[in-house]
């Protein structure tokens, strides 16, 4: 059947619309377009004849249409005059005419809305508020925004004149928003500049701070008042019901215990013409003495002796307190208290036993700390390290080790090679290096406070060739974008260049590519499931090169979202159903199935023989991968129509 | 109800064949791998290797790579496990378990078992 | 291929006691753990899978956990029919491997 379809249907004006013509018959003649729902020919637009390919004007041609060999009609630059209907009056080669209408209407492109009100500075639960929606627009909607959210339902908003009006009753400090309104016709949507509302309100009753209410003598005092108040409070203080000044801080320094007293703080807004008073009691104590800290043992030894700290003076009827790193005391079996809290014992010390430690003596108003104690903790040596790392020296350089042990007082070191004594030194230098000078270097730290010793013993040699290095790995199986990688070519060589190889190509350029330690590391940020390659390090010196085994870097990753296969989602009755799952992952994923939410089997594909229509619904793949931690899944629908009445799929 | 019903007990000499048969009901057989697992007598478990019937995908313990040979037969849901060269301390009980799913799954139901004597 | 370390190898306990079983695997095989009880002359029985999920039908008193290398069955109140020997199987890629197993007796 013939159809017009116009394009758009809704048209602003000065755009253009197109009429478009369906199911054209074959063996045309020629064909008319009209002005209206009828054939007029007062009220022809343009005729088309199809055999010599000309278009003639008719009355109510205007010079703006253009017709189409297939007979749509373009209307360019339209005008309001133009909505309304069009009829196509198609002539046959047998003379047999066919006719077809379409319409479609005109709107005017809206201008940019502004919003009027009635009143700008509202007083809070007293005033209301009118808001305008500027110009008033024939065949516009009107809507409203508050602070870009569409408007909440209140009983104290309401929306009048053709929702051009948003009135808002008994105005809050809350309706303190930024207002827009909007205005929409079929073909154009235009939104105000925002009006913000300035809602005078306060002030609220005040509040003083700080809140503690007690000092001792010769404290400052600081107090501060805050009101809620739109515009801001005016303050004044009162100190035993006499005015002291109009500020907002009342400061009194080296108070007594004379400065005790009611405290009030007015606040008064002078557009509300309101003022309200918050009223607080403060109380000056005398000063208390100062307590110390006295040690039965200065100098106590690691693991080996007790040291008693104990609180002064001794007060009765008084609360002491400990702090030890300015933390109260931990729960620890070596920590203990006397019955009265002023001897804090601590049993067996270890070198993180130094403190500081304080402690306090309470009063009615506050603590008084005194200065505080360190421990000076005699310990170790541990056993100490030997620097540089490397193991691997060529002939002809310099051999420069250097030894530390963490001890209390300072370690005295010693260096034997070979089990042979050489110095006393923390640092041991030997120049110019040769093979005889490989060996067992070992480096001895003594305490002379604790009478104890540590060794430790690192094996030199001094060697033109370069071992077979091989690579060590912080993290054998790491999570896709979650773990980074640390590969560090081993061993650790003096005056030696390291190198890396990719599947046997250099390291590509990559933000994610880090090399660092002299380029004997290697660290892969975030890694991904294309990380998944083999890595070799290689060393060189100017003598000779080696290169290490590949190590492959296994990726956890996944699963990825489930793809079910095939895509059919229709089927016949009496089909099999065969769907089968695939999610990319590393290790495998476990797979398993749900039917509307039922628990299924865990298999990679779901067969149902002969389904029927009771088969409908939803088939969910899940997988998941512990490895990663991550799952995913998937949901198709399936329709199964009885034999015959639809011509869907088969499996 | 999933069923796994094996083959008979066989006695074999040293150096000879062996081939154990599986056979399935109860599921949809080319969904399931099905898996071979040994103990040997007041011994633990060993696990052999896999077979997917669906595709006759296999995958073998290092241990029996070359000496076990796994197929299956659709037409008649079975899985049989074939292990050459035989020596005495192949005597066991010879299982085979289905997969409770596919990839990285324990094994849900298992065979009675087929005790195989290797003797000379 | 990762090795799968039971303890103890066998214990006993009374009716009602409280057992643990522990499982430790030579590398992460993170929550891939499955436990098999297997009673004198019968087939193994799957409990658990994934370290901690309840195979369906087996009683509540059987629990599983940990994650990584270290895993536990609990029987948490031991009853006459649970005399068996329980293995644990890491199944985190092939080859699958069981642990030696862990005898279970009523004192």
């Known amino acids: 059947k013939l159809t017009i379809e116009s394009t758009p249907f809704n048209v602003a004006e000065g755009k253009e619309v197109l009429l478009l013509v369906h199911n054209l018959p074959q063996h045309l003649f020629g064909y008319s377009w009209y002005k209206g729902e009828r054939v007029d020919g007062n009220r022809q637009i343009i005729g088309y004849v199809i055999g010599t390919q000309q278009a003639t004007p008719g009355p109510a041609y205007s010079g703006r249409e253009i017709i189409y060999p297939n007979a749509s009609l373009l209307i360019q630059n339209i005008i309001q005059n133009d909505t309304g209907f069009y009829t196509l009056h198609v002539i046959k080669s047998d003379l047999v005419n066919e006719e077809a209408t379409g319409q479609f209407r005109v709107y005017p492109e809206l201008p940019k809305p502004s919003i009027s009100s009635n009143n700008s500075k509202p007083v809070e639960d007293k005033d209301a508020v009118a808001f305008t929606c500027e110009p008033e627009t024939q065949d516009a909607t009107y809507l409203w925004w508050v602070n870009n959210q569409s408007l909440p339902v209140s009983p104290r908003l309401q929306l009048s004149n053709g929702n051009r009006t948003l009135t808002l009753f008994n105005v809050t400090r809350n309706d303190t928003a930024s207002y827009k309104c909007e205005t929409q016709n079929p073909v154009s949507a235009r939104r105000s500049d925002s009006v913000i509302l300035n809602v005078l309100y306060g002030p609220d009753a005040p509040t003083i701070s700080p809140l503690n209410t007690s000092y001792r003598s010769g404290e400052n005092l600081n107090l501060s008042c805050h009101a809620a108040s739109n515009p801001p409070a005016q303050y004044s203080w009162f100190v035993n019901g006499t005015f002291q000044q109009s500020t907002q801080e009342l400061f009194i320094p080296n108070i007594t215990v004379n400065n005790s007293g009611s405290y009030t703080c007015q606040a008064h807004n002078s557009d509300t013409g309101l003022n309200r008073t918050t009223v607080t009691t403060i109380t000056v104590y005398a000063e208390p003495p100062k307590p110390f800290i006295t040690s039965n043992n200065s100098n106590p030894v690691e693991d080996e002796d007790a040291v008693a700290l104990t609180c002064e003076p001794e007060i009765q009827n008084t609360t002491y307190l400990w702090w030890v790193n300015n933390q109260s005391l931990p729960v620890s079996p070596r920590l203990q208290l006397s019955n009265d809290n002023r001897t804090l014992t601590l049993l067996s010390v270890t070198r993180n036993d130094v403190g500081p430690y304080e402690c306090g003596i309470q009063n009615e108003l506050s603590v008084d700390h005194s200065d505080p104690v360190i421990l000076n903790v005699l310990y170790g040596p541990d056993d100490p390290t030997i620097s540089p790392s490397y193991t691997y020296y060529r002939p002809g350089v310099n051999l420069s080790l250097s030894c530390h042990a963490a001890s209390n007082p300072p370690a005295q070191y010693s260096w034997l090679i070979d089990g042979n004594i050489q110095q006393h030194t923390q640092e041991l230098f030997i120049s110019n290096i040769t093979e005889k000078n490989s060996g067992l270097y070992t480096c001895q730290a003594n305490n002379s406070a604790s009478g104890h010793s540590r060794t430790t013993v690192k094996t030199i040699t001094v060697s033109a060739e370069l071992p077979k290095p091989s690579i060590s790995s912080n993290n054998s199986k790491p999570v896709e974008d979650k773990d980074a990688v640390a590969f560090t070519c081993e061993p650790e060589a003096q005056n030696t260049t390291y190198l890396w190889w990719v599947n046997g190509q250099s390291l590509p350029v990559s933000p994610r590519l880090q090399l660092s330690n002299g380029n004997r590391t290697l660290t892969l940020f975030n890694v991904t499931r294309n990380d998944a390659r083999a890595y070799v390090c290689g060393i060189q010196n100017s003598v000779s090169a080696n290169r290490s085994d590949p190590v492959t870097l296994d990726v956890l990753y996944g699963p990825d979202t489930p793809i079910i296969s095939p895509p059919d989602s229709s089927y016949l009755s009496g089909a099999n159903l065969n769907l089968s799952c695939h999610s990319a992952s590393n290790p495998s994923p476990q797979y398993s199935w749900r039917i509307n939410g039922i628990p299924q089997q865990h298999t990679q594909v779901l067969f149902i023989a002969k389904i029927t229509p009771n088969n409908n619904g939803t088939y969910a793949c899940f997988v998941s991968n512990l490895a990663t931690g991550r799952n995913n899944s998937i949901v198709k629908s399936i329709t199964v129509s009885a034999s015959g009445t639809s011509p869907g799929l088969s499996a | 109800q999933v069923q796994l019903v094996q083959s008979g007990a066989e006695v074999k000499k040293p150096g000879a064949s062996v081939k154990v048969s599986c056979k399935a009901s109860g599921y949809i057989f080319t969904s399931y791998w099905l898996h071979w697992v040994r103990q040997a007598p007041g011994q633990g478990l060993e696990w052999i290797g896999y077979?997917?019937?669906?595709?006759?995908?296999?995958n073998y313990s290092q241990k029996f790579q070359g000496r076990a040979t796994m197929t299956a037969d659709t037409s008649t849901s079975t899985v049989y496990m074939e292990l050459s060269s035989l020596r005495s301390e192949d005597t066991a009980v010879y299982y085979c378990?289905?997969?409770?799913?596919?990839?990285?799954?324990?094994?849900?139901?298992w065979g009675q078992g087929t005790l195989v004597t290797v003797s000379s | 291929d990762i090795q799968m370390t039971q303890s103890p190898s066998s214990l006993s306990a009374s009716v009602g006691d409280r057992v643990t079983i522990t499982c430790r695997a030579s590398e992460n095989i993170y929550g891939y753990l499955a436990w098999y009880q297997q009673k004198p002359g019968k087939v193994p029985k799957l409990l658990i899978y994934n370290a901690k999920n309840l195979v369906e039908g087996v009683p509540s008193r059987f629990s599983g956990s940990g994650s990584g290398t270290d895993f536990t069955l609990t029987i948490s109140s031991l009853q006459p029919e649970d005399v068996a020997t329980y293995y644990c199987q890491h199944h985190y890629g092939t080859p699958y491997t069981f642990g030696q197993g862990t005898k279970v007796e009523i004192k």
């Open positions: 077979i997917n019937p669906n595709t006759g995908y296999t």
């Open positions: 378990a289905r997969e409770y799913g596919n990839y990285n799954y324990p094994l849900d139901y």
